[in-house]
Interface confidence: medium
């Protein structure tokens, strides 16, 4: 829902969280605003207080229930409103009819760990967090490895076009410190986007054995 200099964007984590960002040029800093969620076929509604993340941008998380509870389905529509207090009144500043499974952004993968490391390769595994069982295996992943002297932005992206929660990194340099990140995206949803990157996993390849070509 966009109005010139106003933008209201929300994503569903596929379980029990809708995260929203509202940006509005010239909005009053000291105004109390909230996001109100009103599902079309559920008995609950939920609000969260918008907190500033920059001079003209506010964010909040609608917590719909326990982290792994399935609070919405593919047929749900949730009316999301930004309400700002003006005296005793609540004014509607932005509104959208939100289709949760068209606007997915999963939680970052967790529990990254080195399964096995050698001189030139490393096997890494991870887990997805709070992802709906509706996806079954319809997920994809992107991974990147930070090499010495480079930035994350320079790191080539490795794409896993299936639900594969491990990777074997090859052609690594012996006795070298690396960092690794992964992110996940469901195949479903017109406006679905990648999860945030996982926390980096640091690992070091084994040194080459002296006098041996490994």
């Amino acid at each position: 829902a966009v109005n010139g200099t106003s933008q209201f964007t929300c994503f569903y984590n596929s379980r029990a969280n809708i995260s929203c960002v509202w940006s509005q040029d010239g909005a009053l800093q000291d105004t109390s605003c909230q996001v109100h969620a009103w599902p079309d076929r559920r008995r609950w509604n939920q609000t969260c207080e918008l907190l500033p993340v920059s001079q003209a941008s506010w964010a909040c998380n609608l917590i719909l229930g326990a982290p792994d509870s399935q609070k919405l389905t593919t047929v749900d529509i949730v009316t999301l409103r930004v309400l700002c207090r003006e005296g005793v009144r609540w004014r509607v500043m932005a509104i959208q009819d939100f289709k949760p499974f068209e606007n997915l952004r999963l939680m970052a993968p967790i529990s990254l760990q080195v399964v096995h490391v050698e001189t030139h390769r490393c096997n890494i595994s991870w887990e997805i967090s709070q992802a709906s069982h509706y996806f079954e295996r319809h997920l994809e992943f992107e991974a990147r490895t930070l090499s010495p002297g480079h930035t994350w932005e320079e790191a080539p992206l490795l794409t896993l076009k299936q639900k594969q929660e491990w990777i074997c990194l090859e052609t690594l340099t012996p006795d070298t410190q690396y960092e690794f990140q992964v992110r996940v995206k469901p195949l479903q949803g017109e406006f679905t986007t990648w999860s945030p990157w996982s926390q980096p996993l640091a690992f070091r390849t084994k040194p080459a054995a002296l006098g041996k070509d490994t």
Partner: nanobody
Framework: QVQLQESGGGLVQAGGSLRLSCAAS????????MAWFRQAPGKEREFVAS????????DYVDSVKGRFTVSRDNAKNTVYLQMNNLKPEDTAVYYC????????????????WGQGTQVTVSS
Amino acid sequence: QVQLQESGGGLVQAGGSLRLSCAASGDVFVRYTMAWFRQAPGKEREFVASVTDSGRTTDYVDSVKGRFTVSRDNAKNTVYLQMNNLKPEDTAVYYCAANTDYFQIRSLEFNTWGQGTQVTVSS
């Protein structure tokens, strides 16, 4: 704020139908709960019907339930009042009103009003 312009009023016989339109301009229409009010000669202005910003909730005064239907087209920035089985007591000036106050539905304290359109129902 929005500016509102009603149209569609006129003279109709009892039992007939009219469709009122209210075109909005000047602001983001979808932010507003829209309502129709009416004022008959010598009487106070009264609430007729309302539709919330998303169009999901409508409300009617008891005297028009089952005869009048309020709707909105957010793509066209327009709210409608379909009036069927009109009665002489429906004769009044009909006003379109807009409000961004989330909890004000039937109140006369709507932010913005149109100029009104005359509906006359003859017996």
